[in-house]
């Protein structure tokens, strides 16, 4: 039975040109995490595997940094980065847990004066 829960940063906003940390936390389970995938819609951003470490997708290598922890840092944000991001925890014996984060990238002035979402 899958007892775990994923806590995420939820809906967040950031300024164009800035950076943001995406974080998920798996709790309430003693299952072993074997791999964490970070995806944007259907695109793979990065993988952190228990035996192989981190792999950053070549198309994101310049703008994505692993960490802190199992999180992911997105840099040099553009408006095109707006959208859904998913953290997928592969665990044994529970199976797969998925968390969702919605990121809105705003023009600098908009972000300063009334962002729709607040960074927790």
């Amino acid at each position: 039975m899958m007892t775990g829960t994923i806590e995420t940063t939820g809906n967040i906003s950031a300024e164009k040109g800035g950076s943001i940390i995406l974080q998920c936390h798996l709790s309430s389970t003693t299952a072993q995490v074997t791999q964490v995938n970070w995806e944007q819609q259907d695109q793979l951003l990065a993988i952190c595997n228990a035996d192989l470490g981190w792999h950053i997708s070549p198309s994101f290598k310049d703008r994505v940094a692993p960490g802190p922890g199992l999180g992911l840092t997105l840099q040099s944000l553009t408006v095109n980065d707006t959208g859904e991001y998913f953290c997928i925890y592969h665990t044994y014996p529970d199976g797969t847990y998925t968390g969702r984060i919605f990121l809105e990238v705003l023009e600098s002035s908009v972000a300063e004066h009334g962002a729709r979402f607040q960074i927790p």
Partner: antibody, heavy 117, light 107 residues
Framework: QVQLQQPGSELVRPGVSVKLSCKAS????????MHWVKQRHGQGLEWIGN????????NYHEKFKNKGTLTVDTSSSTAYMHLSSLTSEDSAVYYC??????????WGQGTTLTVSS | DIVLSQSPATLSVTPGDSVSLSCRAS??????LHWFQQKSHESPRLLIT???QSISGIPPRFSGSGSGTDFTLSINSLETEDFGMFFC?????????FGGGTKLEIK
């Protein structure tokens, strides 16, 4: 098997600089963070900073920003920490340790740095 | 920076006893808390990761619990090789930080 090899000791004069090394083997060097940790005699552990060899991305503890510089040589799978303007306060054991899915899962044996005239 | 406070600073116990070591964070770190053991003149060794995940090769008498700001490392039926220093460490945010340690000594 995973190994992080560090020289056992370094003896340097106050005011000079030193470059500590950490040679990694048994895994893909560019896929794991490399951390550096300081431990003064019989005391606690202090995180200095880390570097991701795949991109060169670094993070430093504010306290060590003007003291240490982290670099890597991916061709030899070696991480380096350059410590400058050494004083007796820098005398300590310095460990390197890697992080992938789990932080600090493998550690070097540590280099004992002695700063003395 | 996130401050990790460990208690007690020193614990004197007898082999066969069970103990609980505490680590408290100055703000929520979710489950991004890891436990290490360090014996004299040795490098630290990872015991428990992400608050409660066991590590391959570590005896099952070591277990971890907690989330948010309060964490516990439990050791059941202590053996002589279990004595030494124990540190907690957080990976929730840069800079990573360590607790000051708990010394587990033989009574």
């Amino acid at each position: 098997q995973v190994q992080l090899q560090q020289p056992g000791s370094e003896l340097v004069r106050p005011g000079v600089s030193v470059k500590l090394s950490c040679k990694a083997s048994g895994y893909t060097f560019t896929s794991y963070w490399m951390h550096w940790v300081k431990q003064r005699h019989g005391q606690g552990l202090e995180w200095i900073g880390n570097i991701f060899p795949g991109s060169g991305t670094t993070n430093y503890h504010e306290k060590f920003k003007n003291k240490g510089t982290l670099t890597v040589d991916t061709s030899s799978s070696t991480a380096y920490m350059h410590l400058s303007s050494l004083t007796s306060e820098d005398s300590a054991v310095y460990y390197c340790s890697r992080e992938g899915l789990y932080p600090f899962d493998y550690w070097g044996q540590g280099t004992t740095l002695t700063v003395s005239s | 920076d996130i401050v990790l406070s460990q208690s007690p600073a020193t614990l004197s116990v007898t082999p066969g006893d069970s103990v609980s070591l505490s680590c408290r964070a100055s703000q929520s770190i979710r489950n991004n808390l890891h436990w290490f053991q360090q014996k004299s003149h040795e490098s630290p060794r990872l015991l428990i990761t992400y608050a409660s995940q066991s590590i391959s090769g570590i005896p099952p008498r070591f277990s971890g619990s907690g989330s948010g700001t309060d964490f516990t490392l439990s050791i059941n039926s202590l053996e002589t090789e279990d004595f030494g220093m124990f540190f907690c460490q957080q990976s929730n945010s840069w800079p990573y930080t360590f607790g000051g340690g708990t010394k587990l000594e033989i009574k």
